[in-house]
Interface confidence: medium
């Protein structure tokens, strides 16, 4: 029961986290600039991974996609890549984890298969969360190091001077959404990995066997039968009785006065 709850909660937390990563990636407010010194109007400028916007004091808002990839900082491209990788891994992880959920029955899927799928999705969620956290952190670092107070050094170009507008860059809402979402995805992934341990069938050193007492010649055999879970071997080499023992699959269907369990 605890395993099912842990797995289910991990799935839900990861789902919320991935939804948050998608939301952060699409948001326009990754960095915001208050153009306090603009003499024309109070202009509020904000930028996302895909476009930048300007909002005037009148309420007028305009957004435009970035014109070219060449004019964009390499770090922005890296952040885009990290966020997309995070989303893709998270989406695949969600798909895998749906089939891995203990509360969902799909055919005759064994617990060992569900355990493996849970672990796979958990790892995917962890990597997805790390990608999102890394992407947001890289962007935040880019703001702090490069743009905190943008330089207003003029340089002469064709047709006149060009300068970077004097603005104070601050963290946008998308950064905080990204950090929280990445953290949730990471936590969800860890929960899935924990749930995987509980889902893995415990190794049993016996199969249900029926013993056929053929006289008093009961042999004391080493090794014996062991559940073939694929999770290790009988290292303790426990001895079990096997007096003409047969597995329950081999036992005859008709009753016998000598058959007992």
């Amino acid at each position: 029961m605890a395993v099912t709850a842990c797995q289910g909660l991990g799935f839900v937390v990861s789902l919320i986290g991935i939804a948050g990563i998608i939301a952060a990636t699409c948001m326009d407010q990754w960095s915001t600039q208050d153009l306090y010194n603009n003499p024309v109007t109070a202009v509020f400028n904000y930028q996302g991974l895909w476009r930048s916007c300007v909002r005037e004091s009148s309420g007028f808002t305009e957004c435009r996609g970035y014109f070219t990839l060449l004019g964009l900082p390499a770090m922005l491209q890296a952040v885009r890549a990290l966020m997309i990788v995070g989303i893709v891994l998270g989406a695949i992880g969600l798909l895998v984890s749906i089939f891995a959920l203990k509360c969902i029955r799909i055919g005759s899927m064994e617990d060992s298969a569900k355990a493996n799928m849970t672990l796979t999705s958990g790892i995917m969620f962890i990597v997805s969360g790390l990608c999102a956290i890394a992407g947001v952190s890289v962007f935040a670092n880019m703001l702090v190091t490069n743009f905190w107070m943008s330089t207003a050094n003029m340089y002469t170009g064709m047709g006149g001077m060009v300068q970077t507008v004097q603005t104070r860059y601050t963290f946008g809402a998308a950064l905080f959404v990204g950090w929280v979402a990445g953290g949730l995805t990471l936590i969800g992934g860890v929960m899935m990995c924990i749930a995987c341990r509980g889902l893995a069938p415990e190794e049993t050193n016996y199969k249900a066997v029926s013993y056929h007492a053929s006289g008093h010649s009961v042999a004391y055999k080493p090794g014996g039968f062991k559940a073939s879970t694929g999770f290790g071997s009988n290292t303790k080499n426990k001895k079990i009785y096997d007096g003409g023992a047969r597995t329950e699959d081999e036992v005859q269907s008709y009753p016998s006065k000598h058959d007992y369990v």
Epitope: Q33, L35, N38, V40, T41, V43, N45, Q47, R51, S52, C53, V54, E56, S57, S58, G59, F60, E62, C63, R64, G65, Y66, F67, G71, L72, P73, L76, S150, G159, G160, M161, V162, Q163, T164, V165, T167
Partner: nanobody, 120 residues
Framework: QVQLVESGGGLVQPGGSLRLSCAAS????????MAWYRQAPGKQREFVSG???????NYADSVKGRFTISRDNSKNTLYLQMNSLRAEDTAVYYC??????????????WGQGTLVTVSS
Amino acid sequence: QVQLVESGGGLVQPGGSLRLSCAASGVDISSDVMAWYRQAPGKQREFVSGLTRGGSINYADSVKGRFTISRDNSKNTLYLQMNSLRAEDTAVYYCNAEIYTGTFYPRSYWGQGTLVTVSS
């Protein structure tokens, strides 16, 4: 390549009028913020008038009621109609385009300037 070319400057008598033009290429004249600035000899560059994509218009207190800013989107040109000119309006007038949308780095583009001299 962005180019802002000012024209229409010259010598004018006090009380006279002039119309400055700023022909833009490589940039939309309905940019986020289009403005006129001026720089008198030995002084700092100062804001004269500006308008935004959203239609907000602002003027420096010293030119209010005398100067009018406008734009012609079809010609991609910004204008500054200057009436009742005074001697203190003598300066080099610069056209400015500030772009915030469609670029990761907000940019400010400047023309080379046109000289306006008000003298009798």
